[in-house]
Interface confidence: low
């Protein structure tokens, strides 16, 4: 008789794939445009990335550092109207993309929470949650919560409002903190909160250190659902050496939890990489005409258009990973086990019941290495086979689908491998 299938866990929509942050509507759409109506035209692109949610804004009226001139219920006319927003919600819904609204109050100002008027701001947030939930948004984000006095109790209250409306609504909080104790204390009082932080960016970017960061985080947060990113709002390129970008994409998509990216992460967009570009909001490089004032500043391989046509590009890797993440049970909600491997490597397995299993091997080092996989650390339920099929490599030159002998596995410098193997009873 076949063994009984393991009961599937309850899956919320944000468990099923990545979130995509667009913090600056104008920079995302490029020079000379940047409103909600224009964003509607980019939803097909977001669909092609297979992201499950769009974290948008802030979009509300905010005069720098002026509480009286900050209205969380009103969309800043520069971004469009409430009608434009409603249309965007409808269009996103048709494409199965959820919309999360950033309500960080003083986003144009010095202290994002108007430090001297916390209580009146908190009341405004409460009213705004109810207003925008009625309008049909799927969740909210608030950032810089380390600057919000009594953050835990406010977050608990806001989560109650959000979840009270529907269990299918999400609250995301962002912090600049990379301190695990601070992060855990914020999470303790909020059972379903998704927290983005700088935790992973406070790293020496070695395999050993990354492994210990990930395992400490998972141990400290218990069995709650995590999110993975390198910061609450920034681009991956601002925190990572260029040669590790692909490796981190593979890792973020295959760790247990929700990967969270910022617009441009999928093409390796850099803050202030181009002449004449403001540092704080790099313009999304859709094609070579993204910088009309500076001929030749943008080459095809930096753009969405150029990378879409190149199967070896970062964008193609992102799409492949996002696709795997959204359809494979073991990556969606599988168990996670790390095990010993060569110096500079971080290796782990994702598995769920009798579904296909995935092995991830990441070489953070700048030398080629034997994987040296030591399965003795693994529980019996997650043992390693002798061979596994290559799903993808972060480097060119390997044939996808080819079987690799795990005992003889060698990795190139900064190479990450995603391998699959079947469950064997």
């Amino acid at each position: 008789r076949a063994p009984r299938c393991r009961e599937l866990p309850a899956q919320k929509w944000w468990h099923t794939g990545a979130l995509y942050r667009i913090g600056d509507l104008q920079a995302f759409q490029g020079h000379g445009s940047g409103n909600l109506a224009g964003l509607k035209g980019r939803l097909d692109y977001l669909s092609s990335l297979k992201v499950k949610g769009l974290v948008l804004g802030p979009l509300h009226k905010n005069q720098k550092d002026d509480v009286a001139q900050t209205d969380l219920l009103q969309i800043d006319p520069n971004f469009g109207s409430k009608e434009d927003f409603d249309n965007l919600l409808q269009s996103a819904k048709k494409k199965s993309i959820r919309v999360i609204l950033d309500l960080t109050p003083n986003y144009r100002g010095e202290n994002l929470w108007f430090s001297t008027q916390v209580d009146s701001v908190a009341t405004k947030v409460k009213d705004a949650l109810e207003f925008w939930l009625q309008a049909g948004v799927d969740g909210f984000q608030v950032r810089d919560i380390e600057n919000l006095k009594d953050a835990s109790s406010f977050l608990a209250e806001w989560e109650n409002i959000t979840k009270g409306f529907s269990e299918d609504r999400l609250l995301i909080a962002g912090t600049n903190s990379s301190d695990l104790q601070q992060i855990v204390s914020l999470l303790e009082s909020n059972k379903d909160l998704l927290l983005t932080s700088s935790y992973l960016s406070d790293s020496s970017f070695t395999g050993e250190h990354t492994k210990s960061l990930v395992t400490q985080y998972l141990n400290a947060t218990g069995n709650r659902w995590c999110s993975w990113s390198l910061s609450q709002a920034g681009l991956l390129t601002s925190f990572l050496p260029a040669q590790l970008l692909r490796l981190y994409q593979l890792m973020l998509f295959t760790l247990p939890g929700t990967p969270v990216f910022s617009y441009g992460d999928e093409i390796g967009l850099k803050a202030a990489a181009l002449p004449g570009q403001p540092v704080e909001a790099p313009v999304m490089l859709w094609d070579e005409s993204s910088f009309p004032d500076i001929p030749g500043a943008v080459s095809a391989n930096m753009t969405v258009k150029g990378q879409s046509e190149d199967p070896g590009s970062l964008l193609s890797l992102f799409r492949q990973l996002s696709d795997q993440r959204s359809k494979e049970r073991s990556l969606l909600h599988g168990d996670f086990h790390t095990f010993s491997s060569g110096p500079g490597l971080f290796s782990y397995i994702r598995h769920w019941d009798q579904n296909e299993r995935f092995l991830v091997v990441l070489n953070f080092g700048d030398v080629g290495l034997s994987a040296g996989l030591q399965a003795s650390d693994l529980p019996a339920s997650a043992s390693l086979p002798t061979k596994a099929d290559l799903v993808l490599s972060t480097q060119p030159g390997r044939e996808e689908g080819s079987p690799l002998e795990l005992e003889r596995l060698k990795l190139e410098p900064h190479e990450g491998l995603l391998l699959r193997f079947p469950y064997v009873a």
Partner: antibody
Framework: QVQLVQSGAEVKKPGASVKVSCKAS????????MHWVRQAPGQGLEWMGL????????SYAQKFQGRVTMTRDTSTSTVYMELSSLRSEDTAVYYC??????????????????WGQGTLVTVSS | DIVMTQSPDSLAVSLGERATINCKSS????????????LAWYQQKPGQPPKLLIY???TRESGVPDRFSGSGSGTDFTLTFSSLQAEDVAVYYC?????????FGPGTKVDIK
């Protein structure tokens, strides 16, 4: 209130290195870029580079590339600027200055406020 | 790199008189997407670090007297003193923060006539 306090004056020989510190207080250290600007005697202001204290990433002016290193210590809220292979024309007052305001750790508007009190570095044989 | 130039190099004005300093950038520092000019003005007195007066080309920093005002867009900017005071004697610099490397004008020395 927001304050930047720099280390004291230094006298160095040509070819040597100097490391200037800048201790920040009164705000969340990792939330703002820190810049270094220098001013030779009787001259104007020259931007040297910036460090993002959150991740430690840096951006240097081409002129100083290869000679300057900016680092930070988040436990003491201090940034450091080290300039190597010193020559007499590096004699200047070196200032640290915080980015005017930041919406996130990678989203800063880079006017400079406040400034440190300045550190005079004299390079002389 | 964006090159900043200032004129005049120096000027002497009577107390209470109006004065203007000009600043020009070699390329536009107006960012179309948010319609903001990425330009700041600073005041520096002898032996002191520079002090921020104006950012976004025309927004006065809090605590800065309203006799200081900034204007202009694109590549041409002006710092205006509506009524010069003795404590305004200093060197004034403009700075672009549109793109790296961030650059300053050479400075304008303001004295009392």
């Amino acid at each position: 209130q927001v304050q930047l306090v720099q280390s004291g004056a230094e006298v160095k020989k040509p070819g040597a290195s100097v490391k200037v510190s800048c201790k920040a207080s009164g705000y969340t250290f990792t939330s703002y870029y820190m810049h270094w600007v220098r001013q030779a005697p009787g001259q104007g202001l020259e931007w040297m580079g910036l460090i993002n204290p959150s991740g430690g990433s840096t951006s240097y002016a081409q002129k100083f590339q290869g000679r300057v290193t900016m680092t930070r210590d988040t436990s003491t809220s201090t940034v450091y600027m080290e300039l190597s292979s010193l020559r007499s024309e590096d004699t200047a007052v070196y200032y640290c200055a915080r980015a005017g305001y930041c919406r996130s750790t990678t989203s800063c508007f880079n006017w400079f406020d406040p400034w440190g009190q300045g550190t005079l570095v004299t390079v002389s044989s | 790199d964006i090159v900043m130039t200032q004129s005049p190099d120096s000027l002497a004005v009577s107390l209470g008189e109006r004065a203007t300093i000009n600043c020009k950038s070699s390329q536009s520092v107006l960012y179309n997407s948010n319609n903001k000019n990425y330009l700041a003005w600073y005041q520096q007195k002898p032996g002191q670090p520079p002090k921020l007066l104006i950012y976004w080309a025309s927004t006065r920093e809090s605590g800065v007297p309203d006799r200081f005002s900034g204007s202009g867009s694109g590549t041409d900017f002006t710092l205006t003193f509506s009524s010069l005071q003795a404590e305004d004697v200093a060197v004034y610099y403009c700075q672009q923060y549109y793109s790296t490397p961030f650059t300053f004008g050479p400075g304008t020395k303001v004295d009392i006539k």
